[in-house]
């Protein structure tokens, strides 16, 4: 058996480190074996067999220049085995960091802090963590640890399935390289690292008959479970097309009706989501949608709805414009008659 | 030689924008994590922001959350720290610093003032 | 985000007398912490790091030890050139923070 211990990696390559000490061992001979030492496709002998060092040869310092292919041989001159030497540094502890777009899984990735110049793999698992006594502030590990399975395609990310909202997870990332290892513990709460997907479909149509209206309809992320036991609320923001300034309005539902949309001009808006109990952080914004209120008047018809104000909306006073207020209706609805006369505005 | 030269501090209003940049050379800038710290006149050490080699992953002090973005050219070896919504208190020396690893600044460069004031 | 605090803040000692330095964590960091002088004017320089090592090119009258939440900076015979603040700072978690610093003057 060969006296030289496999790293990890490639086999026949031997590692080491720059301005280190770095030994070389001979692969086909006997522990201890004095050899000779040559550079693959150089004659000059690097180390002779009477150095005392056996069937290992010593870099001192080594540097980029001492990477390459060598060649070690017997007393007789048989061929003892080639050696690659591969320079580079042992891991540090990799970046992690984990993200939640639900309440039942999260996925955490990572990325070295420092390349080593090694071929590197990293392992995952994890723990979930359980509070000891009512009142205790220590943590002990519970049952585990479990892997956390890595993603297929090589992506530097791993997904915990079935997480509990309310338990805490201690993950493990740990670098590994042929010259060691170093580990990332990360504690991880479900309920600080969830952020929701943003709200999907969003539609803004004009309501007929109502020049400042627009009508905002969503739905839930396909990412959110299907039957929530938490629910999301959502945060709505639009603008007129040119206007820098959002106004913002919280819906209590999955539609809004903007009540103070400037007449004639396209709307630009935009939903974000949150755990309805404030875990975690908002959503990034959905993809902007745009409509533009209706121009004309209200149908002569009066919807089954429609109880006290038939009249058409004013005209707009462009020498008075009102500033754009925020919607502020509690729980949207398709039309809502409070107010008696819509005043229209127009950015001046 | 490990060598790191910050730019682009100065004198900016409250409110105004900044950004300071880090050359580096000596070493193999794309294999290490980077980092600005920062020391107000007469204070102490303020860990500001780091990047991974890759870029991948960021962090950021509370202080400056949402206002600055860092950033890294590996092309170009040169470290970036974007500063929106400047505000007095981030009057301070800023120095580029370098790993091993993460949080172990190894080498620094000699800073660059950034004075906010009207 | 985990508190790091220095004693004393400032001290002044005579050549050749032991100065020592202490740190304190909020929480556990385990060896993570690392040692800085900086001089009047100048960047910080690392000289301890992972607690107890010594950076390459620092003099071995400087030494660190600890581990947890207490740790020890010690210079064993302080030198002029040793005038400088110096600070702790833990790298345990991915936001790095320094202790307040303790100033070294000579008697």
């Known amino acids: 058996s060969s006296p030289c211990p496999q790293a990890w990696g490639p086999p026949g390559v031997q590692y080491g480190q720059p301005g280190r000490s770095v030994k070389l061992c001979c692969p086909g001979v006997t522990a201890g074996d004095p050899v000779s030492w040559f550079r693959d496709g150089e004659p000059k002998l690097l180390q002779g067999p009477d150095s005392g060092l056996g069937h290992e040869l010593v870099l001192a310092q080594a540097d980029s220049t001492d990477e390459g292919t060598y060649i070690c041989q017997t007393l007789d001159g048989a061929l003892g085995g080639t050696v690659t030497l591969q320079l580079g540094y042992p891991p540090a502890r990799p970046v992690v960091s984990c993200q939640a777009a639900d309440y039942e899984n999260f996925s955490c990735t990572w990325s070295p802090s420092q390349i080593s110049g090694l071929p590197t793999r990293y392992l995952t698992s994890y723990r979930k963590k359980t509070v000891l006594g009512a009142d205790s502030q220590r943590r002990s590990p519970s049952t585990g640890p479990w892997p956390c399975p890595q993603d297929p395609l090589g992506a530097a990310r791993c997904v915990v399935h079935g997480a509990e909202f309310w338990s805490q997870y201690r993950i493990n990332v740990t670098e590994v390289n042929p010259l060691g290892a170093s580990t990332r513990l990360l504690d991880v709460s479900l309920q600080s690292i969830l952020r929701p997907d943003p709200p999907q479909g969003l539609r803004v149509e004009s309501v007929p008959g109502y020049p400042r209206r627009l009508r905002a309809s969503w739905t839930y992320p396909a990412s959110w479970p299907c039957q929530p036991h938490f629910l999301l609320k959502f945060r709505l923001q639009y603008r007129p097309a040119q206007h820098p300034a959002w106004s913002t309005v919280e819906p209590a539902g999955l539609e809004e009706v903007i009540t103070d949309a400037v007449a004639g001009l396209p709307h630009a808006v935009r939903v974000s989501a949150r755990d309805f109990l404030d875990a975690g952080t908002w959503s990034t914004w959905s993809p902007e949608a745009w409509g533009t209120p209706s121009t004309g008047t209200i149908p002569k018809e009066i919807p089954a709805w429609g109880q006290l104000h038939t009249q058409p909306e004013v005209e707009p006073q462009v020498d008075s414009p009102a500033p754009p207020r925020p919607s502020l209706q509690p729980h949207p609805r398709l039309l809502d008659h409070r107010d008696s006369v819509e005043q229209v505005a127009v950015l001046a | 030689e490990v060598q790191l030269l910050e730019s682009g501090g100065g004198l900016v209003q409250p409110g105004g924008s900044l950004r300071l940049s880090c050359a580096a050379s000596?070493?193999?800038?794309?294999?290490?994590?980077m980092t600005w710290v920062r020391q107000a006149p007469g204070k102490g050490l303020e860990w500001v922001s780091s990047?991974?080699?890759?870029?991948?992953?960021?962090q950021y002090a509370d202080s400056v959350k949402g206002r600055f973005t860092i950033s890294r050219d590996n092309s170009k070896n040169t470290l970036y720290l974007q500063m929106n919504s400047l505000r007095a208190e981030d009057t301070a020396v800023y120095y580029c610093?370098?790993?091993?690893?993460?949080?172990?600044?190894?080498?620094w460069g000699r800073g660059t003032l950034v004075t906010v004031s009207s | 985000d985990i508190q790091m605090t220095q004693s004393p803040s400032s001290l002044s000692a005579s050549v050749g007398d032991r100065v020592t330095i202490t740190c304190q964590a909020s929480?556990?960091?385990?060896?993570?912490l690392n040692w800085y002088q900086q001089k009047p004017g100048k960047a910080p320089k690392l000289l301890i790091y992972?607690?107890?090592n010594l950076q390459t090119g620092v003099p071995s009258r400087f030494s660190g030890s600890g581990s947890g939440t207490d740790f020890t900076f010690t210079i064993s015979s302080l030198q002029p050139e040793d005038i400088a603040t110096y600070y702790c700072?833990?790298?345990?978690?991915?936001?790095?923070?320094f202790g307040p610093g303790t100033k070294v003057d000579i008697k």
């Open positions: 610093a370098k790993g091993p690893g993460w949080g172990t600044f190894a080498y």
């Open positions: 000596g070493f193999t800038f794309s294999w290490y994590s």
């Open positions: 990047i991974v080699p890759s870029g991948g992953h960021t």
């Open positions: 929480q556990d960091i385990n060896n993570y």
């Open positions: 992972d607690a107890s």
């Open positions: 700072q833990q790298y345990d978690n991915l936001s790095p923070t």
